[in-house]
């Protein structure tokens, strides 16, 4: 595989990661699908200081980031350890909540408007930001 | 000048198999996704596949899940679609066509076109 | 799956004719949506993404509106070499992008 060393046009770059800020809203599920698309993923928040850098792009916008627990437990996207990890929920986030009216609870993490994280129904159409690592070598499968 | 040139396709049996391919050239290849979308005689347009630019992340629709799939080689600038168990709806003009505008997700060059005929 | 519906499925028009074309999607889309011109025997052309942003090179006479659920591409002034199938195509479910079934633009 090849390894990626500069980020994709309309990409930041960001202590040895790129990230790209989208525009308009998706569902978390088709946010995740772009991302992938683009060899990325939906980020990883792994540090205050990431979060700070994320939380400035976007401004004060619901948007979706790589934490979900659609299958049970909180899992990062990347499998980054949810347990032992940075955390930034809001106050007596996430709630599961259900009275939104819209079948289920809430399984999708997203920022707030100031940035701290909630839960909410996967389907709702937020922004997202996709995040790859620079210096990571590519998935392309070995030539046959 | 950008360009996409499909081959590969013709006259095939139900259950049969064929491999279409696609030459890219004028781009970076591998800085795109790329889609197959096929068109039934007389019919409208269906998207059939895409892959990532690395390869790494490929997806279907629905009615070629668990028949097709689609691989790149980026050293060669070339997309593929290998097709398997072969039905008579499968039956179109098959084009490749590069996600060039990703944030719209817009297919924004097209190949010519193969022609596969799934017939006994 | 989403599901895209064009309108009219066919049109007649003569030259210099102000022509719209209408697309309505099943569920809102924000802005996701594409238009393309397909003539016969040719592959298809993206003329308008992102609902309203002009593809290069593309003519100014094409334009695009609309969001969430319903879309409109309008020729200003149609030409000779506008007689074509235009297709609508949802971008926002990623990646199961439908198309609408096309509308033909038939010589009056």
């Known amino acids: 595989g090849s390894e990626r060393t500069c980020c994709p046009v309309n990409w930041v770059e960001h202590e040895r990661s790129c990230y790209w800020f989208s525009r308009s809203g998706k569902a978390w599920a088709d946010a995740d699908n772009y991302c992938r698309l683009e060899d990325a993923h939906l980020v990883v928040v792994t540090s205050w200081e990431e979060q700070k850098f994320v939380q400035h792009h976007i401004g004060p916008v619901n948007t979706w980031m790589g934490l979900h627990d659609q299958n049970g437990p909180w899992k990062w996207v990347d499998g980054t350890d949810y347990e032992t990890g940075f955390k930034n929920w809001r106050p007596e986030q996430p709630d599961d909540w259900y009275g939104h009216g819209l079948g289920g609870g809430e399984d999708c993490a997203h920022f707030t408007d100031d940035g701290r994280w909630n839960d909410d129904v996967c389907q709702r159409p937020y922004r997202w930001v996709c995040e790859t690592e620079l210096d990571k070598a590519s998935q392309e499968p070995p030539l046959l | 000048e950008v360009q996409l040139l499909e081959s590969g396709g013709g006259l095939v049996q139900p259950g049969g198999s064929l491999r279409l391919s696609c030459a890219a050239s004028g781009f970076t290849f591998r800085s795109y996704a790329m889609s197959w979308v096929r068109q039934a005689p007389g019919k409208g347009l269906e998207w059939v596949s895409v892959?990532?630019?690395?390869?790494?992340?490929?997806y279907f629709a629905d009615s070629v899940k668990g028949r097709f799939t689609i691989s790149r080689d980026n050293s060669k600038n070339t997309l593929y679609l290998q097709m398997d168990s072969l039905r008579a709806e499968d039956t179109a003009v098959y084009y490749c066509?590069?996600?060039?505008?990703?944030?719209?997700?817009?297919?924004?060059?097209w190949g010519q076109g193969t022609m596969v005929t799934v017939s006994s | 799956d989403i599901q895209m519906t064009q309108s009219p499925s066919s049109l007649s028009a003569s030259v210099g004719d102000r022509v719209t074309i209408t697309c309505r999607s099943s569920q809102s889309i924000n802005s996701y949506l594409n238009w393309y011109q397909q003539k016969p025997g040719k592959a298809p052309k993206l003329l308008i993404f992102a609902a309203s942003s002009l593809h290069s090179g593309v003519p100014s006479r094409f334009s695009g509106s609309g969001s969430g659920t319903d879309f409109t591409l309008t020729i200003s002034s149609l030409q000779p070499e506008d007689f074509a199938t235009y297709y609508c195509?949802?971008?926002?479910?990623?990646?199961?992008?439908?198309f609408g079934q096309g509308t033909k633009v038939e010589i009056n």
């Open positions: 195509q949802q971008g926002y479910n990623t990646p199961t992008w439908t």
């Open positions: 066509a590069k996600r060039g505008i990703p944030e719209a997700d817009a297919f924004d060059i």
């Open positions: 892959i990532s630019g690395s390869g790494g992340n490929t």
